[in-house]
């Protein structure tokens, strides 16, 4: 018969014949022959392969180094790599999450639009007219100016994006 030029899914072509790929969690020891099946071996502890493969070496699990602010989000297995994330108050510097940086704080005059997560930084926004923030914070949103009217008071000092309005008593009309 004609030697194959393509193989089925989960097979690979070698020496003009189709051999079975090794399943996830196993590496290739020897290719199949006319008389023998593909020989595969399980990955060692702290190693993995996450696809049907013909790799002769397993990949090492990622190390979530606590000294870089990392912690384990999902423990590695023979079929999956370890997934790292950052400690509370920190976020990954890249998609691969190889190190962490402290969450950014929003300066006075800016409020938090979106609180940071283990993988994304704080998103700040300028406080619009009618709102203020007088602190540097990774959590605080812009606060609305105090409504003097609802307290039967009047504005004595206008608010800014960094300060609240100052309310005071209404001037009494002299008789």
């Amino acid at each position: 018969p004609e030697p194959p030029t393509a193989c089925r899914e989960k097979q690979y072509l070698i020496n003009s014949q189709c051999c079975s790929l090794c399943q996830p969690g196993q590496k290739l020891v020897s290719d199949c022959t006319e008389f023998t099946e593909t020989e595969c071996l399980p990955c060692g502890e702290s190693e993995f392969l996450d696809t049907w493969n013909r790799e002769t070496h397993c990949h090492q699990h990622k190390y979530c180094d606590p000294n870089l602010g990392l912690r384990v989000q999902q423990k590695g297995t023979s079929e999956t790599d370890t997934i790292c994330t950052c400690e509370e108050g920190w976020h990954c510097t890249s998609e691969a999450c190889e190190s962490c940086v402290l969450h950014r704080s929003c300066s006075p005059g800016f409020g938090v639009k979106q609180i940071a997560t283990g993988v994304s930084d704080t998103i700040c926004e300028p406080c619009p007219v009618g709102f203020f923030s007088n602190v540097s914070s990774a959590f605080e949103k812009c606060h609305p100016w105090t409504s003097c009217e609802t307290k039967d008071l009047v504005v004595q000092q206008a608010g800014t994006n960094k300060t609240d309005v100052v309310c005071g008593p209404q001037d009494r009309l002299r008789a």
Epitope: G25, S46, Y63, R71, T80
Partner: antibody
Framework: EVQLVESGGGLVKPGGSRRLSCAAS????????MHWVRQAPGKGLEWVAY????????YYADTVKGRFTISRDNAKNSLYLQMNSLRAEDTAVYYC????????????WGQGTLVTVSS | DIVMTQSPSSLTVTAGEKVTMSCKSS????????????LTWHQQKPGQPPKLLIY???TRESGVPDRFTGSGSGTDFTLTISNLQAEDLAVYYC?????????FGAGTKLELK
């Protein structure tokens, strides 16, 4: 037959140090990750530390971080736990347990060694 | 950290009966890569070290009798012992094997009626 034998337990004063050992036999020690797990008298189980087969990956429980050090000597088929700045709450039976590269579970446990921290 | 909550804390049982105990985790134990739930059960008899009973939620360790059955997914898990034997009297611990720190439930103790 898989065997894990802990030693080094005993009475220690608060602030003191102790080194626990776990001698492994009946399997290829260098192929397995290893854990220390402790159990306070009459209480449940608490994971303490893990070291990967090749020494590359080490994780600790927050309760012992900075005070305890896990290590291994594959040539001697031995696992160690160096415990410094010991506190009364560290009093427990300390077990070593192995983790294989298939289940990723603690599949064999030693008999344990008791560490008592008291003045 | 993942909190493992077991109930009941103790059960008074008789030989031959069917026993069910629950374990809940504070977050999912499902590995997104291989779709396995990394929930482990250990059995600890008085004066002995723990012994691996079930891993991946429902896979019995070699030598464990088939009267032990693990089930569940995500955050809710169950260990069932059918036709309970006297030698099954022990404390059963569920364990998060999904992430570090590894965490255990407080245990369910089986006592003879």
């Amino acid at each position: 037959e898989v065997q894990l034998v802990e030693s080094g337990g005993g009475l220690v004063k608060p602030g003191g140090s102790r080194r626990l050992s776990c001698a492994a036999s009946g399997f290829t020690f260098s192929d397995y990750g290893m854990h220390w797990v402790r159990q306070a008298p009459g209480k449940g189980l608490e994971w303490v530390a893990y070291i990967s087969s090749g020494n590359r990956i080490i994780y600790y429980a927050d309760t012992v971080k900075g005070r305890f050090t896990i290590s291994r000597d594959n040539a001697k088929n031995s696992l160690y736990l160096q415990m410094n700045s010991l506190r009364a709450e560290d009093t427990a039976v300390y077990y070593c347990a192995r983790q294989d590269g298939y289940r990723y579970a603690m599949d064999y446990w030693g008999q344990g060694t008791l560490v008592t921290v008291s003045s | 950290d993942i909190v493992m909550t077991q109930s009941p804390s103790s059960l008074t049982v008789t030989a031959g009966e069917k026993v069910t105990m629950s374990c809940k985790s504070s977050q999912s134990l499902l590995n997104s890569g291989n779709q396995k739930n990394y929930l482990t059960w250990h059995q600890q008899k008085p004066g002995q070290p723990p012994k691996l009973l079930i891993y991946w939620t429902s896979t019995r360790e070699s030598g464990v009798p088939d009267r032990f059955t693990g089930s569940g997914s995500g955050t809710d898990f169950t260990l069932t012992i059918s036709n309970l034997q006297a030698e099954d009297l022990a404390v059963y611990y569920c364990q998060n094997d999904y992430t570090y720190p590894l965490t255990f439930g407080a245990g369910t103790k089986l006592e003879l009626k």
